[in-house]
Interface confidence: medium
């Protein structure tokens, strides 16, 4: 018997070192995966049993010959994948019976030459992959054929020239994608693309195109249907007004010029591309943008300048420069990414003219933006910005009114900086529509009563690992945030808070309070009694109190928190939990108590929260394997559908001595009083 796995109508026989086709698979399979074996042939007679096959994948084998009768035996075959084999020749007969094929993958074989018309009968073919084969010509046949072809992949071959007579076989095709990447192209002969019925996307990445060849290419694309042109990873060191001039008579909408070591973007380089909507200039070496660099891009919606500029060297003069008004022509631009650059700072008119901009990413963009002032973003005053990413910019101070120009902003990300200040609240002046402020991973933030008084619309506030100070002031800094649904105060070593810290936050759904120091606040011996800072949070869904040193949970602290779905109390020092503390948590889905000091799991504590649990984590607790301590728990474990991972290995008895290291689930409860499962 074979070791193939069969699920529904799919047989997976991959990676089995097969030298022959298995003969005992179900006869109704429609998909057969034979990849990564040691097959040398696909004998047609061996497939007689599998006449329902629609997809046959025999990639990554050692097949050197294909017999025409295979498709006769498999009349419903639509996808044939033979990539990474040893086919060296295909003749007129090879696919003669494969009339119903829609996809044929011959990538990574040794087909150096196409003789005559091996694809003449493939009138249903929509995808043909001949990349990585050593072909020296695009000619796949004489006479018009492959009229339904949509994707022709010829990357990584040895094609030196594109000639009209070698592409005329595509005269009736509407190619959605022609990939000629990684070919050493040196010539685009006149009319070479005109012979293709329609060509919508052309990929010429890594094709060693210089500026002159690029210009020639664009003229050959003139008056075609081209919409998407990818010229990434060439040697397009400079562009000028003439580089893309041939594209004037096209409706090009996407252009990828990434990874070109592009140094000089000449004025008017894009002036002939009024239909362009997407432009990528990622990973280049641009020295300067001037007010006419983007002239003509009147319909551009998306522009990526990620890592597009010169990297700084010893000389300060090598700093890339973005002149004022460089973006002034991009009146429909909605998305601008300038991540990972070495721009010194913003100027008063850096972003002027971007009157449709919604998403601006400036992560790790600036070298001298330590202080944000009310001038930093003045050039965005007329932009309807919704999202602003300012992460990783070594920002240390935010001045009052910095964001006052951004009245429509919804998401402000200031994480992963070095902000070190007292938040007066004036920093956020004017952010009247703000939804989320992300401040996590900064140096030091001191709160005041008015820190967030000017942003009542805020729904998400992230303050993780910011050495937060003054959390215990009254009234609470969070009091104005009536709409808050997510609050992250984790990793701040907070030890002192008041009972009214979260008062009035009735809409809070997620509270992250892990990695703080709340242990004293929940002790009975705490002066003034335990601090119940969770009261009134009636819509709380997720509560994380991991790693807080907690060794007590006061009675009533979870009372009325009926909507709690997840509680994480892992990595604390909890031992004996009071009865009934989880009585209102009957809707709980996830409970994490791993790495505590829990010895007993009793019904009056855990019965209610276990009722509807999907997931329980109580690993690494020192369970006391006695009837009183765990018989109810063991019985529950053995009849529940709750997911309890690593139950066999990480739920082990600690006491009594003779049970040490014994798996909890194997504890025999039959001799325990009142242990019957129906008691649950």
């Amino acid at each position: 018997t074979n070791q193939c796995t069969v699920r529904y109508n799919v047989a997976d026989c991959s990676h089995l070192k097969l030298t022959h086709i298995p003969d005992d698979l179900p006869s109704n399979i429609t998909v057969l995966n034979l990849t990564h074996n040691q097959l040398r042939r696909l004998p047609p007679t061996n497939f007689t049993r599998y006449s329902q096959l629609a997809i046959l994948d025999a990639g990554f084998n050692s097949i050197s010959k294909l017999e025409p009768e295979l498709c006769q035996i498999l009349p419903l075959l639509k996808v044939l994948n033979l990539q990474h084999n040893e086919l060296s020749q295909i003749s007129d007969q090879t696919f003669v019976f494969c009339t119903n094929l829609t996809e044929l993958d011959l990538m990574s074989n040794s087909i150096h030459k196409i003789k005559s018309n091996p694809f003449k009968n493939q009138k249903n073919l929509i995808k043909l992959d001949l990349s990585h084969n050593g072909l020296s010509s695009t000619k796949l046949g004489t006479g018009v054929q492959l009229e339904n072809l949509q994707e022709l992949l010829l990357a990584k071959n040895k094609i030196l020239a594109l000639r009209s007579e070698e592409l005329e076989f595509l005269g009736n095709s509407s190619l959605r994608k022609l990939d000629l990447s990684s070919n050493p192209l040196k010539e685009f002969s006149p009319g070479c693309f005109q012979t293709i019925g329609k060509l919508f996307a052309l990929l010429l990445n890594n094709a060693q195109l210089n500026p002159h060849l690029t210009e020639k290419l664009c003229w050959e694309l003139s008056n075609t249907s081209i919409q998407n042109l990818s010229l990434a990873n060439n040697q397009l060191l400079a562009t000028s007004e003439s580089t893309f001039s041939g594209l004037k008579w096209t409706n090009l909408t996407q252009l990828d010029l990434s990874y070109n070591n592009l140094h000089d973007v000449g004025n008017g380089s894009f002036s002939y591309l009024p239909s362009l909507r997407y432009l990528s200039l990622e990973y280049n070496n641009i020295q300067r943008l001037s007010p006419r660099s983007f002239y003509g891009l009147s319909n551009l919606r998306y522009l990526s300048l990620k890592r597009a500029f010169t990297k700084q060297s010893v000389s300060l003069a090598s700093h890339p420069n973005i002149d004022d008004f460089s973006f002034q022509w991009l009146k429909y631009l909605e998305y601008l990414n300038m991540d990972d650059n070495n721009i010194p700072s913003t100027k008063s008119n850096t972003f002027t003219g971007l009157v449709s901009l919604k998403y601006l990413s400036l992560s790790k963009t600036f070298t001298s933006l330590q202080t944000l002032t009310n001038e930093t973003f003045v050039s965005l005053a007329h932009s309807p910005l919704l999202t602003l990413n300012l992460t990783k910019n070594h920002i240390s101070k935010i001045a009052n009114g910095t964001f006052s120009w951004l009245g429509q902003l919804r998401i402000l990300d200031l994480g992963l900086n070095e902000i070190e200040q007292k938040l007066s609240g004036q920093e956020w002046r004017g952010l009247r529509n703000i939804f989320e402020i992300y401040l996590s991973y900064n140096k030091y933030l001191q709160l005041s009563t008015s820190s967030f008084a000017l942003v009542p619309s805020l729904q998400r506030l992230m303050l993780r690992r910011v050495a937060l100070k003054n959390v215990d002031i009254s009234p609470s800094p969070f009091r104005p945030l009536r709409n808050l649904t997510i609050l992250d105060l984790s990793n701040n070593n907070i030890a002192n808070i008041n009972e009214d810290l979260l008062e009035g936050l009735e809409n809070l759904e997620i509270l992250d309070f892990q990695h703080n120091n709340l242990a004293r606040l929940w002790k009975r011996a705490n002066p003034g009694g335990p601090v119940n800072f969770l009261k009134g949070l009636s819509h709380l869904h997720i509560l994380n109190l991991e790693s807080n040193g907690l060794d007590e949970i006061p009675v009533g602290v979870f009372k009325n928190l009926f909507e709690l779905k997840s509680i994480n109390l892992g990595l604390n020092n909890l031992n004996k939990l009071e009865p009934f503390i989880f009585d209102d948590q009957t809707s709980l889905r996830s409970l994490n108590l791993q790495k505590n000091l829990i010895t007993s799991v009793e019904k009056d504590v855990f019965g209610p929260p276990f009722q509807n649990l999907n997931s329980l984590d109580m690993r690494f607790n020192p369970f006391d394997c006695t009837c009183e301590s765990i018989s109810w728990f063991v019985n529950w474990i053995n009849q529940t559908h709750t997911n309890i991972s690593e139950l066999s290995t990480h739920y082990l008895c600690n006491t009594p001595h003779h049970y040490y290291g014994f798996p909890l689930k194997l504890f025999d409860t039959s001799s325990c009083k009142d242990s019957a499962p129906f008691e649950l």
Epitope: N9, V10, T30, V31, A54, I55, D57, K78, V79, N81, T99, N100, T102, E103, D105, K123, N124, I126, K127, E147, N148, Q150
Partner: nanobody, 115 residues
């Protein structure tokens, strides 16, 4: 990702007609081959009819002359018109599309032919 939703099944008298529809979302029908298969209780799933990008069609012998497969690219829909129905046509009818090397199936629609 392609989603297929069949409709049009039901209970019909022998000799009657039905028109099954299959709507695809996520990928237009102009790409690839689209077919109808059927599975009677306790039997394997068998091809009924299939239509190709070129417009070519193929039919199982058991339905030839009684069924017509067609498609409307604008509506992303493929149809199976079945006439002169027989009790042996009773089955769950499934729509099938092959897209970029993946075999997609609908949930099926029940056709019951009573005598």
């Amino acid at each position: 990702e392609v989603q297929l939703v069949e409709s049009g099944g039901g209970l019909v008298q022998a000799g009657g007609s039905l028109r099954l529809s299959c709507v695809a979302s996520g990928s237009p029908f102009s790409i690839g081959a689209t077919g109808w298969y059927r599975q009677a209780p306790g039997k394997q799933r068998d091809l009924v009819a299939e239509i190709y990008p070129s417009g070519d069609t193929i039919y199982a012998d058991s339905v030839k002359g009684r069924s017509t497969i067609s498609r409307d690219n604008a509506k992303n829909t493929v149809y199976l018109q079945m006439n002169s129905l027989k009790p042996e046509d009773t089955a769950v009818y499934f729509c099938n599309v092959v897209r970029w090397g993946v075999d997609y199936w609908g949930q099926g629609t029940q056709v019951t032919v009573s005598s």
